[in-house]
Amino acid sequence: LRLLDHRALVCSQPGLNCTVKNSTCLDDSWIHPRNLTPSSPKDLQIQLHFAHTQQGDLFPVAHIEWTLQTDASILYLEGAELSVLQLNTNERLCVRFEFLSKLRHHHRRWRFTFSHFVVDPDQEYEVTVHHLPKPIPDGDPNHQSKNFLVPDCEHARMKVTTPCMSSGSLWDPNITVETLEAHQLRVSFTLWNESTHYQILLTSFPHMENHSCFEHMHHIPAPRPEEFHQRSNVTLTLRNLKGCCRHQVQIQPFFSSCLNDCLRHSATVSCPEMPDTPEPIPDYMPLW
């Protein structure tokens, strides 16, 4: 988790002088509770936005937006703590809006936004906005949280972001898998424009089960430049294992930008349909 590399993060708006500060996620008001605290944020919204760094790289960011409730507690609102928690790693990053002037009621509802938390493809986050100061230990909570799922690199806009392109999102192998005679699969895919090797993983499963019954890896050496964007054809031999009929073919490239952690593409061959054979009717009825 990190912030987009903007030199000056701004939270000021007409009628409010405000500055964005790094935060330890442990606001001082936790340690020194105040008697009067503001109410919680209203209408917290998280959306996927995209932003360029100063170097021109494009990153997905969490666009966080919320409004204030129209009550007198805004007189005691000193700022907000924005927290983003990555759920699979428990990593947390916070920033603090520090209000340098008192809020006053005006004809429009106060609205705040922040779009500088860089998020990763295919990750889920919990976004929390805490109004400051935080409540006393038994006080009503004055925060709002929402979960936010970032699409993976298959998503059209995500595909062209720097992290997705670095992991090979622009490569479309267009995998085809064909069942041949004599327990063979013919796998065909389009090579990328890089002299790097690939590995094909064949995993076979019984019908309707997810425990594999056979697994085989096939290595494809780095193509020559004249083979870039050409189709590569590989014939894999299946093993005649009873019921081991569903096959997943997964292709992993080793591009220089993502090394051994590039996006993988897969295709599946289902078990052949079994014809419904009716129960044979006996031509006599046993008497016992």
């Epitope: 590995q199 993983l201 995993t203 425990h211 594999s212 019954c213 056979f214 697994e215 085989h216 890896m217 093993r239 997964q250 992993q252 051994n260 952690d261 993988r264």
Partner: nanobody, 113 residues
């Protein structure tokens, strides 16, 4: 989550032998293909050998006839027996479980001439 731990690397003279081990945690090891890769300084990671779930093996051309990959499913371990070692075999050797794309931390093999 599968964890792979390699061991057995070291310094050996040209023509000598080493046996690398890769211990895997987690169940269903016997149904997994496994592989060895190696990475020399300033080079990309290269395929060395693979063994499928039935114990059938494939080797990179550079090591064919000198290296042998094997597995012991009872011990959840895959081995790489390296004979007739050459200075160009010097690299960090990595164990790989392709399905989950798990990698070990690597073990250094140095072959002196």
């Amino acid at each position: 989550e599968v964890q792979l731990v390699e061991s057995g690397g070291g310094l050996v003279q040209a023509g000598g032998s080493l046996r690398l081990s890769c211990a895997a945690s987690g169940s269903s090891f016997r149904f997994r293909a496994m592989a060895w890769y190696r990475q020399a300084p300033e080079k990309q990671r290269d395929f060395v050998a693979t063994i499928n779930s039935l114990g059938e093996t494939t080797y990179a051309t550079a090591v064919e006839g000198r290296f042998t990959i094997s597995r012991d499913n009872a011990k959840n371990t895959v081995y790489l027996q390296m004979d007739s070692l050459k200075p160009e075999d010097t690299a960090v050797y990595y164990c790989n479980e392709p399905r989950g794309n798990y990698w070990g931390q690597g073990t250094q093999v140095t072959v002196s001439s």
